[in-house]
């Protein structure tokens, strides 16, 4: 496996891009078991109906790769479990991709960009202790492709969801 | 060690106001935002406002343009203004955490009551 983008080893922020700029997703810091800070993007806007809220990675050379995989650890809130919001709080998120030859594009309009899926929290996921906290660690891995540009873009889109991405890695396979 | 104290409650007549405070300390620096709850008689709990650590706000819709939440990182302090109050806002009002990360409650403060009179 050859990695084109792996959120948890970034130094600092990691900058990427939200629509709208304040009310959807934050970058926020926490800390793992080492006292490592992990960079995530949280949203939780569970009480407002009809969410949009974009996040978009910057952009991801392609490496003349034709197929790409896509790994998102993520925490999803099981709407039960937060008080009185069950006819507003949703519980999947959809994942987007746009292709682009352009390293710095400003701005990629909502229509442009390609789905890949509709990303739910499994049955199975994996228990990480965080100090006294325990995360409950959700795995999805997506591929997408055939990719022609000399790169791309992912973008998250958050429709009411309480969710975490907690770590983004993308890579490909080495024939 | 988590402590939550809630204050401000009270009888008001209905169309008045009260603003409550909640003094939170021991959350981690993850919390991602401080919201504010309610619970009536014989009712469930429900989540009314909430604020994030970048200070975006958002609302339950019977109290949307109603109500108004802040927060005051520096004294650790969550506020709840409560105008034009109506009867059906009576409960008891509590203030918690809430993160994507963590699936549950495990400490709740007092609470502090609220009582709406027609």
């Known amino acids: 496996e050859v990695t084109l983008l792996d959120s948890r080893s970034v130094q600092g922020e990691l900058g990427w891009i939200a629509s709208p700029l304040e009310g959807g997703w934050e970058e926020v810091s926490i800390m793992d078991e080492k006292n490592t800070p992990i960079r995530t993007y949280q949203v939780c806007n569970v009480m407002e109906p009809s969410q949009n809220n974009w996040l978009r990675t910057d952009w991801i050379t392609r490496e003349g790769a034709q197929r790409v995989y896509i790994e998102i650890k993520f925490t999803l809130r099981d709407c039960n479990s937060l008080p009185g919001v069950m006819g507003t709080c949703k519980e999947t998120f959809n994942l987007y991709y746009y292709e682009s030859d352009n390293d710095k594009e400003r701005f990629i309009r909502e229509n442009q960009f390609v789905k890949i899926d509709t990303i739910a929290a499994d049955e199975s996921f994996t228990q990480v202790d965080i100090g006294d906290r325990i995360m409950k660690l959700n795995t999805e891995i997506r591929d997408v492709g055939p990719l022609s540009k000399k790169g791309f873009y992912l973008a998250f889109q958050d429709v009411g969801a309480c969710i975490a991405l907690v770590s983004v890695r993308v890579f490909y396979k080495k024939a | 060690q988590v402590q939550l104290q809630e204050s401000g409650g009270g009888l008001v007549q209905a169309g008045g106001s009260l603003r409550l405070s909640c003094a939170a300390s021991?959350?981690?620096?993850?919390?991602?935002?401080i919201g504010w709850f309610r619970q009536a008689p014989g009712t469930k709990r429900e989540m009314i406002a909430a604020?994030?650590?970048?200070?975006?706000?958002n609302y339950a819709n019977p109290v949307k343009g109603r109500f108004t939440i802040s927060r005051d990182d520096a004294k650790n302090m969550v506020y709840l203004q409560m105008n034009n109050l109506k009867p059906e806002d009576s409960a008891v009002y509590y203030c918690?955490?809430?993160?994507?990360?963590?699936?549950?409650?495990?400490?709740w403060g007092p609470g502090t009551q609220v009582t709406v009179s027609s």
């Open positions: 021991g959350f981690a620096s993850d919390a991602y935002a």
């Open positions: 604020v994030t650590k970048a200070g975006a706000t």
């Open positions: 918690n955490a809430i993160s994507p990360l963590w699936d549950e409650y495990d400490f």
